[in-house]
């Protein structure tokens, strides 16, 4: 029970990575991250 980051994202699909607190769905090509997701395996806000 440490503070170290989990080695993998336990999310459905292959498009999630640890961004900040949670595993988030990344942004599509050509878009940039405005804000990370606010729940496990959530969607990032992209622009």
């Amino acid at each position: 029970q440490g503070g170290t980051r989990s080695p993998r994202c336990d999310c459905a699909g292959d498009f999630h990575k640890k961004i900040g607190l949670f595993c988030c769905r990344g942004c599509p090509a050509g878009h940039y991250l405005k804000a990370p997701c606010t729940e496990p395996c959530g969607n990032s806000t992209c622009l």
């Epitope: 503070g3 336990d10 900040g20 607190l21 990370p36 606010t38 395996c41």
Partner: antibody
């Protein structure tokens, strides 16, 4: 032994600013996300800010967004909360808390809390 | 935001008996088989202390008299048998989704 010691509270006028500090010891500070939680005089608890372990991402509820800024200095093992545009409803005891990851690093539990620093906003 | 409603707001229980405090969420706080629900104890002049996380996992160092249960939207904290030292405020808290939110608290008095 994990220790969190807050400081910087006090009496401030509405519209004023204050910067709180939280000195951490007894654990690898840089490996943990950290939060600020406040407790109003009526004893209600409200989470007001969080910062990821890597110092990259910050999170706030709507009630303080744009007025409060959380930051950390991992070298100094210190957490900060900069508060501006203070209102009477910001009057509270402010606690810093360590966030321990659980369940694939996607659940966070506030497992250690400091003793708190009191903030009073009044004219 | 996820709203947590605790009941009762206060109660008095005789020493040695059992007590149950309830916490209801405005929406499910379950994810992937885990309930993202914590219970904290707070005594006067002290910060909150983590008792239980994940609805039912007792934190290290917490007496076995404390137990948690529930899933979805309905959760409870049970203390059995109640001791004098258990006189305190108890809060539930969700970490399913930001912003983290807390219940309004339950004040437990020992008779």
């Amino acid at each position: 032994e994990v220790q969190l010691v807050e400081s910087g509270g006090g009496l401030v006028k509405p519209g004023g600013s204050l910067k709180l500090s939280c000195a951490a010891s007894g654990f690898t500070f840089s490996s943990y996300a950290m939060s600020w939680v406040r407790q109003s005089p009526d004893k209600r608890l409200e989470w007001v800010a969080e910062i990821s372990s890597g110092d990259t991402y910050t999170y706030y509820p709507d009630t303080v967004t744009g007025r409060f800024t959380i930051s950390r200095d991992n070298a100094k093992k210190t957490l900060y909360l900069e508060m501006s545009g203070l209102r009477s409803e910001d009057t509270a005891m402010y606690y810093c808390a360590r966030d321990r990851e659980a369940y694939y690093g996607q659940q966070y539990v506030m497992d250690y809390w400091g003793q708190g620093t009191s903030v009073t906003v009044s004219s | 935001d996820i709203v947590l409603t605790q009941s009762p707001a206060s109660l008095a229980v005789s020493l040695g008996l059992s007590v149950t405090i309830s916490c209801r969420a405005s929406e499910s706080i379950e994810y992937s088989g885990t309930s993202f629900l914590q219970w904290y104890q707070q005594k006067p002049g002290q910060p909150p202390r983590l008792l239980i996380y994940g609805s039912s996992t007792v934190e290290s160092g917490v007496p076995a008299r404390f137990s948690g249960s529930g899933s979805g939207t309905d959760f409870s904290l049970n203390i059995h048998p109640v001791e004098e030292d258990d006189s305190a405020m108890y809060f539930c808290q969700q970490s399913r989704r930001l912003p983290w939110t807390f219940g309004g608290g339950t004040k437990l008095e020992i008779k």
